[in-house]
Amino acid sequence: LKGQEFAPSHQQVYAPLRADGDKPRAHLTVVRQTPTQHLKNQFPALHWEHELGLAFTKNRMNYTNKFLLIPESGDYFVYSQVTFRGMTSECSEIRQAGRPNKPDSITVVITKVTDSYPEPTQLLMGTKSVCEVGSNWFQPIYLGAMFSLQEGDKLMVNVSDISLVDYTKEDKTFFGAFLL
Amino acid sequence: LKGQEFAPSHQQVYAPLRADGDKPRAHLTVVRQTPTQHLKNQFPALHWEHELGLAFTKNRMNYTNKFLLIPESGDYFVYSQVTFRGMTSECSEIRQAGRPNKPDSITVVITKVTDSYPEPTQLLMGTKSVCEVGSNWFQPIYLGAMFSLQEGDKLMVNVSDISLVDYTKEDKTFFGAFLL
Amino acid sequence: LKGQEFAPSHQQVYAPLRADGDKPRAHLTVVRQTPTQHLKNQFPALHWEHELGLAFTKNRMNYTNKFLLIPESGDYFVYSQVTFRGMTSECSEIRQAGRPNKPDSITVVITKVTDSYPEPTQLLMGTKSVCEVGSNWFQPIYLGAMFSLQEGDKLMVNVSDISLVDYTKEDKTFFGAFLL
């Protein structure tokens, strides 16, 4: 009994049929970040909750040391939201004085690390200039897309400034992936 | 004939094989909101179009009284976008006068209600400070992630201020979920 | 052997079982845009990379002439992010002078074209007023949702101002769809 007996006859079947419930999946939620060393030309990676509350990993999708480990090759939907919060910086004052300047910014990157590759691959980036008029500001950056990943690939979320990440609620800052 | 005969032998199958087309799915679109009473410590819930235009519910996923009803336990991808629009608030004027203040904000929450639980669970939150310089402003907040839901769970979208929701177009403000 | 033998007995099966790996899928990434003519009452459409880097199309999902072609009827998750960048416009200056005005804005629309329909259908819209205080600004708009599409439908991404699209990195601006 072959998988393609259930597929339209004009279509090539690349994978055996399988139950959806056994596909690798993970949803990770925010924890308070602690300062760490990171590679010189790379934003720092966030670490995550993987068991408590809304967080889970299942079907061989594991979380270890800031990375989601891809247990099986295939097409995955990968997503993250990071909520940032901060105080107004000099930025708006300099601008009010009429001098042009490089804007302050907040950036989220979902990065793929493949051990056989020397350089990480940036899968998704959300980047936003921040020059708020008021005293406190907060805002989310959301990312999500589909990628062809290989068994053994590792995914992480990097941010431009770890101290601005809102760690207070699991629904504000999160990271997930699932095999399609 | 067991489901796992089609799955890689090293992997546990948690669910029988099933046709993708029969999975519970819904995409709901915005309608003009009418003011209603809401629980004291909870943002008001939006109500939705579930049949006309781009909106649909299928395969036992039903919409009733502001809630999407989950007909079957499993992992769901849940998403929403809410487009807000408003006029400049006090906020920027107060700031121009040099007095610091808490910023105005816009917030979207996707909430899960489980009848056996006394408290709703906030699955996703997008929250943003709003202190626009100009007269009119508008902007979307997008959310989406995967959650393990149980049969009988109910999902709703809550917003901080129902009167700021842009109800004019079905592509601007929407809410959906589908079983993975 | 019928598909529904694997599905819960209370549930109607609408499609035959099929391998997930053979479903139509695409992830397209940004390229530098060239100015082109576009329909009078429609925002210009972006064109995309479909083979190099992170971009791919598979299983009869094809890209041609700014359009993703839907090869098979079904429910698709469709997404896009466009990162915009620009300089401060008249907007903030006019406002500083105290005269109210319509805000500048950035807009992304995911549009469906059906040959048998005279008018395109807007599936998703993200629109945001832009009145930045500083000299340079940049920000993403993300969209994603599920739609019931028909074989032969065509999808495109339209933007309000093609010259503001950040084409510099494949992770900043992208467009994708996959059959659920």
């Epitope: 901060g86 000099e90 907040i106 101290s163 601005l164 | - | -």
Partner: antibody
Amino acid sequence: QIQLKESGPGLVAPSQSLSITCTVSGFSLSSYGVDWVRQSPGKGLEWLGVIWGFGGTNYNSALKSRLSISKDNSKSQVFLKMNSLQSDDSAIYYCASGNFDAMDYWGQGTSVTVSS
Amino acid sequence: DIQMTQTTSSLSASLGDRVTISCRASQDISNYLNWYQQKPDGTVKLLIYYTSRLHSGVPSRFSGSGSGTDYSLTISNLEQEDIATYFCQQGNTLPFTFGSGTKLEIK
């Protein structure tokens, strides 16, 4: 291991400037904020300002006109400069690293006396 | 600026006691309330952040509670090494502000 260490002049003459350096290890200044706090017998703990990972700064408005915070990411150093010191600026000056709302790790402090 | 008030400037307790130190903000600080411990040698450590969350490495006998403007730090079982001054700090709005401190002594 996260460490912060302040080094300052100890003694500063009235109306002169104060310069203190905070040298950090165990984390990268490019992606983490550093606050300055001082403690004087008369005023308790007083927050002076912060420099964020991206380089933006915030100052206590009461001191803003004579305070400047800068950094050198490559040397893992943050600099506090304060002008026109008076006797009530005598205090222990601390640098601390933290999230947007709290100071997670503190240096041991450096004592500054303003006196002629 | 937001004023932070610790009404008790010093407190005497016996080893093993349950000790509570209070702090009041002049306006709602949305749970952005932190507690620090300063030892006699001047060393400062974060104990509790965001009202009730224990910083890494802090013993579980420390706990925090409160909301709005009223907050408290509790030490459930006082130990010798807890002899220190405790400061509250609001992290909701700039400038960050501290309470004047509560000095804890052994009876």
